[in-house]
């Protein structure tokens, strides 16, 4: 506990002090006081540097004195033999004696008292920036007029902060300008303009005089401008060293003027004004700006329009232009939007064709569609080449955005038929010789594929079963082989309206208009074993002459069996209708004269016993196309006959082309188109 005074006596005082003693006293007086320590008696063994016995006085880390020997007062009016005055409130006294004393020494008597110190004069560092006032136990600082004492209670400064400028134009100067500015001050000025305006500061060189920098280049007094995260300065010296026009790019500016204790100059004066925030004229590739200006400022709106072949992609929506507004922060709205090359995307796939994966799907890229040759060809022309157009579509010169259509090549067998002998008198055949051949298993019969969705057959084949099961692509009709081939499912059967339906079909003598169409549920995939036969043209080129050769195929009765296991075929000539009339009906169900012969029938056969027979019905009588020798067309359909192995009658398909086309058109689906 601090005390104002006290006494310190060596051990056993006034008797002799003992040997080998070390004793210390910690003196403490209240803060704001110094210590006056004085000795009234001193009798300690003398030695050089008081090495043997001593009394030591320590203030902090400093030894104030070390005493030994005998002392007496020089002043007859004062008992003090030695004294110390320290301006601190703490002191330590240490007494030490060694192991032997040659004489009897009595030690010491000392007293301390708290004394006032003058903080204003007693220290090297002056505690106050301006006026220092001492009092017993302390001091206080004070300031000249118009200055105020800072919170540290030592420094005085000018009250030059807190001004906020909001006008779009104004002038700011250092305190007392052009008289010297106050020392030891920090002046802060705030400019706060409406958003969208930037503060522009203008100075004249001669309006600036601030204490110059030290030898290391550090400003002793400084002017600093802070705009957001940007700083201009610090500035100091005679004449403004910075740019005379400072565009801050911000609507908020803090001006900080910091001075030290020395070297006051006249200071500074500046003007400021608010400029609408400029937005940079950005280089946005592949686009044009409307309106075009040299400079754009806050609230300006431009329409950015992409050049042809470029688009703005926002989310999943593509647009050709967008609006951008110069914002209060000097940035354009929608700045993330860019005019990118139009992307036509992965080209749509087409049925029975393909498109190579494009290297690029961007504007100007080229792709090529091809059909699965040799089974399909491009029906609607255009060559299959498409380019990515400016509107984002793949476009063909001829078809525009319409996709190419791959349609089956008709009438071209993968392998030509070579006669070997069997049908009746015909030969074994492979389905590749007659890829249009369709097998009906109930009743056992044939048909001809004429496109992806339609099978042509005889009316008498389907009159009793409107939901026939059909197969394509197999040479053999063994169940095991058909199970591995393509089964066709009918959607609807269309029998020619001229075909007379009978209650007892077995007794039929009129086979006029023996033609029907079967619409399939699903399109047939073409290939080497499945491919359609062509229809006859309507021109006279397709009128058959006697002796013209045609091919028939099927799994009907042969000389050896009631049903063929493997496909049989024969080449036979067209014969006059009378040849068919002349043949006696094998198992007549009516009078021979009752059998009807019409111009809708073709008579063929009669050579080497080659003929169609029971089970071949509905199959095509295929004739070489007169205008394209590589192709076959269905000139006839196996219909009926007087006797197997003689002449047979075939429905004349040319007479029904209009009905076929009309029926197919009226019953097509969007899928097919």
């Amino acid at each position: 506990e601090p005390t104002m005074y006290g006494e310190i006596l060596s051990p056993n005082y006034p008797q002799a002090y003992p040997s080998e003693v070390e004793k210390s006293w910690d003196i403490e007086v209240p803060e704001g006081y110094g210590i006056h320590l004085y000795f009234t008696h001193l009798d300690i063994e003398l030695s050089e540097n008081c090495a043997y016995d001593s009394v030591q006085i320590i203030s902090g880390d400093t030894e104030e004195g070390r005493l030994c020997g005998q002392r007496s007062s020089n002043n007859p009016h004062s008992p003090i033999v030695e004294e110390f005055q320290v301006p601190y409130n703490k002191l330590q006294v240490i007494f030490k004696s060694d192991f032997s004393n040659e004489e009897r020494f009595t030690g010491f008597a000392a007293y301390y008292v708290a004394t006032d110190i003058n903080e204003c004069t007693d220290f090297v560092d002056v505690p106050c920036s301006h006026f220092c006032n001492n009092f017993i136990g302390g001091y206080f600082c004070s300031c000249p007029p118009e200055y105020f004492l800072h919170d540290d209670m030592k420094n005085c400064g000018v009250n030059c902060s807190g001004d906020v400028f909001t006008a779009l134009i104004g002038e700011i100067a250092s305190p007392n300008y052009p008289k010297p500015y106050p020392e030891n001050s920090r002046c802060e000025y705030q400019i706060r303009l409406e958003k969208g305006f930037q503060v522009v500061v203008t100075l004249r060189r001669e309006d600036f005089d601030v204490e110059a920098a030290d030898s290391a280049g550090n400003c002793l007094d400084s002017l600093v401008f802070v705009a957001g995260d940007r700083q201009f300065g610090p500035y100091c010296g005679h004449g403004f060293p910075g740019p005379l026009n400072i565009e801050t790019k911000s609507n908020a500016l803090d001006i900080i003027f910091q001075t030290d204790l020395t070297g006051q100059k006249k200071g500074w004066k500046l003007r400021y004004h608010g400029d609408p925030m400029p937005c940079p004229k950005e280089d946005t590739p592949n686009s044009v700006w409307e309106p075009a200006k040299a400079k754009y400022v806050f609230r300006d709106v431009v329409q950015i329009t992409c050049l042809d072949g470029f688009e703005v992609v926002e989310g999943r929506v593509g647009a050709t232009s967008f609006y951008s507004t110069c914002q209060s922060n000097g940035k354009w709205s929608n700045s993330k939007l860019k005019c990118q090359p139009v992307d036509c995307g992965i080209p749509e796939s087409i049925e029975n064709g393909k498109v190579e994966d494009p290297e690029s799907t961007l504007f100007g890229s080229v792709i090529r569609y091809t059909c699965e040759e040799p089974y399909y060809y491009m029906e609607n022309g255009g060559g299959g080449e498409y380019h990515c157009a400016g509107n984002g579509s793949w476009v063909n010169e001829v078809l525009g955005p319409e996709l190419p259509k791959c349609v089956p090549v008709c009438g071209v067998p993968r392998e030509p038929f070579e006669e070997k002998q069997r049908i009746i008198g015909g030969s074994d055949a492979d389905i590749k010789n007659f890829p249009w051949q369709v097998f009906f298993d109930n009743p056992w019969a044939g048909g001809a594929l004429i496109n992806e969705y339609w099978v042509l057959t005889a009316a008498h084949v389907v009159e009793g079963n409107r939901e026939p099961t059909m197969y394509v692509g197999s040479t053999s009709v063994q169940t095991s082989r058909l199970a591995k081939s393509k089964m066709l499912t009918p959607e609807h059967v269309f029998i020619h309206p001229g075909w007379k339906l009978l209650e007892v079909p077995e007794g039929r003598t009129n086979f006029d208009n023996d033609i029907a169409l079967v619409r399939l549920k699903d399109p047939v995939k073409m290939g080497p074993t499945v491919s359609p036969i062509c229809l006859p043209g309507t021109s006279s080129d397709y009128n058959l002459m006697d002796g013209d050769l045609g091919l028939i195929s099927g799994w009907g009765r042969t000389e050896k069996r009631d049903r063929a296991v493997r496909l049989k075929a024969a080449r036979l000539p067209v014969a006059p209708l009378r040849k068919c009339k002349e043949v006696k009906v094998e198992k007549p169900t009516a009078d021979a004269e009752a059998y009807v012969f019409t111009p809708n029938m073709i008579c063929a056969g009669g050579e080497k016993g080659m003929d169609s027979c029971k089970g071949d019905s509905g199959g095509a009588f295929a004739v070489q196309d007169p205008n394209d020798k590589t192709k076959f067309y269905a000139a006839g359909l196996v219909s009926w006959g007087p006797q197997c192995g003689t002449y047979g009658l075939y429905t004349r398909v040319k007479n029904y082309v209009d009905w076929i086309m009309k029926t197919m058109q009226e019953n097509s689906t969007p899928r097919e188109d």
Partner: antibody, heavy 125, light 107 residues
């Protein structure tokens, strides 16, 4: 040359088991159905069992149902008849025969156009 | 189950005779019927399939007819090699059934 050769016959006690095999050659085995037919000494022909080309459909005579099992291994061109719980009345010459099946959903069968020479099974205590 | 009744069970005939064997089905079997010839110690051989179709390689003196329930095998002129036992087979539905057989012997 189309050929069917039966094997696996022999003498077996009543209640015993036997497995007959029929090896086919000279034709595409998996295109045809197959049948087993038996003939007891001095008696007529009795159809025993049949199987279609891929083994998915089978049929049995009432007299063997539940005791005999027909199967085929197309990879080995072989037909089998597993005979369990054999009885004295199963003693016979067992033939395998080829069946032709034409058509898709509507079948046209042509049974037993080719026959093997047979294998003898004797069930006796 | 469909039963097959074959008649006669045996017959004696001379070379050159016309021989007719009949098979009757207990219910209609359309034309799903075959005729087989078996000689002693040999495997059966198919003569006729689908009631009236002659098996390839079989002489034309053999013929089949009928439909539904009544079927006939005819040998127009019996030859020495034709002495054998003949069976009919219905394959209209499972279980398949053979007729009891007709033994044709030399008179």
């Amino acid at each position: 040359e189309v050929q069917l050769v039966e094997s696996g016959g022999g003498v077996v006690r009543p209640g015993g088991s036997l497995r007959l095999s029929c090896a086919a050659s000279g034709f595409t085995f998996d295109d045809y159905g197959m049948s087993w037919v038996r003939q007891a000494p001095g008696k007529g022909l009795e159809w025993v069992s049949g199987i279609n080309w891929e083994g998915g459909s089978t049929g049995y005579a009432d007299s063997v149902k539940g005791r005999f099992s027909i199967s085929r291994d197309n990879a080995k061109n072989s037909l089998y008849l597993q005979m369990n719980s054999l009885r004295a009345e199963d003693t016979a010459l067992y033939y395998c025969a080829r069946d032709e099946q034409l058509g898709g959903l509507k079948y046209y069968y042509y049974y037993m156009d080719v026959w093997g020479k047979g294998t003898t099974v004797t069930v006796s205590s | 189950d469909i039963q097959m009744t074959q008649s006669p069970s045996s017959l004696s005939a001379s070379v050159g005779d016309r021989v007719t064997i009949t098979c009757r089905a207990s219910q209609g079997i359309r034309n799903d019927l075959g005729w087989y010839q078996q000689k002693p110690g040999k495997a059966p051989k198919r003569l006729i399939y689908t009631a009236s179709n002659l098996q390839s390689g079989v002489p034309s003196r053999f013929s089949g007819s009928g439909s539904g329930t009544e079927f006939t095998l005819t040998i127009s002129s019996l030859q020495p090699e034709d002495f054998a036992t003949y069976y009919c087979l219905q394959y209209h539905s499972y279980p398949l059934r053979f007729g009891g057989g007709t033994k044709v012997e030399i008179k």
